[in-house]
Amino acid sequence: MMTGTIETTGNISAEKGGSIILQCHLSSTTAQVTQVNWEQQDQLLAICNADLGWHISPSFKDRVAPGPGLGLTLQSLTVNDTGEYFCIYHTYPDGTYTGRIFLEVLESSVAEHGARFQIP
């Protein structure tokens, strides 16, 4: 039975040109993490394999950095980066756990909601 839960950084609103860290944490299970995949929509961004270490997809090499930990750092954000990101934990013997984070990249720090708009 899968008893674990994924905790994420939570959804993030960030400015164009900035950088953010996406992180997930698997808890409440003794299962061994064999690999963590980071995906956006249907695109693979990066893999962290317990034996082989990190692999960043070639198309994201310039803007994606591994870590901290099993997390992922996205740099030089563009509006096109807005979307849902998935951390997919492959574990033994439990199977697969998935966390979801929505990243919203905004053109400007002054939103139409008002001046006290919060961004990281």
């Epitope: 994420t8 950084t9 939570g10 959804n11 993030i12 609103s13 953010i20 860290i21 992180q23 929509q41 509006v79 096109n80 807005t82 979307g83 849902e84 979801r100 984070i101 929505f102 919203e104 905004l106 053109e107 939103a111 139409e112 909601h113 006290r116 708009f117 919060q118 961004i119 990281p120």
Partner: antibody, heavy 117, light 112 residues
Framework: EVQLQQSGPELVKPGVSMKMSCKAS????????MSWVKQSHGKSLEWIGL????????SYNQKFKDKATLTVDKSSTTAYMELLSLTSEDSAVYYC??????????WGQGTSVTVSS | DVVVTQTPLSLPVSFGDQVSISCRSS???????????LSWYLHKPGQSPQLLIY???NRFSGVPDRFSGSGSGTDFTLKISTIKPEDLGMYYC?????????FGGGTKLEIK
């Protein structure tokens, strides 16, 4: 002035699919995501999902992943939601709402869907 | 999914009253950058919902200052001072910090 104009009420038979629209005006369509919300009679609001008009990216509430399909047409600044294989459980008012910073600031007037044979 | 619990379900009021509506979440709504995406909406009969408060305490444009939001972590409050006839309706809180976004069950503000 920001406006979201939704298509009119629908009476549909069980098992069929239907597509509703949400025409946006008064702002830059691709600068905001568009959320869709369901309200069944006498119940709370439910977030169905959102679409990013800039790149077509979609985030679904898993509960609605096999029920709703979200699309946009940038040229006409219109968002669409198709509801699949309708049942009586899908009878509700559906709202589109402009969203930014994970809140919904402007809402359409709602599209009422009644599923009945 | 994050469960959002609103209390009370019904709130009978008289015009001029001050009232509070509570919204509690099953986990913290602060993200890793310290931002909390908790908003409040008023849904009047025959109308569309309208945004009152976003980011815990920020009033949306045009919203009277008799509406105020507060809270942190898992506990949030909407306060309305000096209730007016146009304030009657269903109030909902929404958490947008975690996927999927989830609404509270609603609080009906009605005349005693």
């Amino acid at each position: 002035e920001v406006q979201l104009q939704q298509s009119g009420p629908e009476l549909v038979k069980p098992g069929v699919s239907m597509k509703m629209s949400c025409k946006a005006s008064g702002y830059s369509f691709t600068a905001y995501t568009m959320s869709w919300v369901k309200q069944s009679h006498g119940k709370s609001l439910e977030w169905i999902g959102l679409i990013n008009p800039y790149n077509g990216g979609i985030s679904y509430n898993q509960k609605f992943k096999d029920k709703a399909t979200l699309t946009v047409d940038k040229s006409s600044t219109t968002a669409y939601m198709e509801l699949l294989s309708l049942t009586s459980e899908d009878s509700a008012v559906y709202y589109c709402a402009r969203s930014r910073t994970f809140a919904m600031d402007y809402w359409g007037q709602g599209t009422s869907v009644t599923v009945s044979s | 999914d994050v469960v959002v619990t609103q209390t009370p379900l019904s709130l009978p009021v008289s015009f001029g009253d001050q009232v509070s509506i509570s919204c509690r979440s099953s986990q913290s709504l602060a993200n890793s950058y310290g931002n909390t995406y908790l908003s409040w909406y008023l849904h009047k009969p025959g109308q569309s919902p309208q945004l009152l408060i976003y980011g815990i305490s920020n009033r949306f444009s045009g919203v009277p200052d008799r509406f105020s939001g507060s809270g942190s972590g898992t506990d949030f409050t909407l306060k309305i001072s000096t209730i007016k006839p146009e304030d009657l309706g269903m109030y909902y809180c929404l958490q947008g910090t975690h996927q999927p976004w989830t609404f509270g069950g609603g609080t009906k503000l009605e005349i005693k």
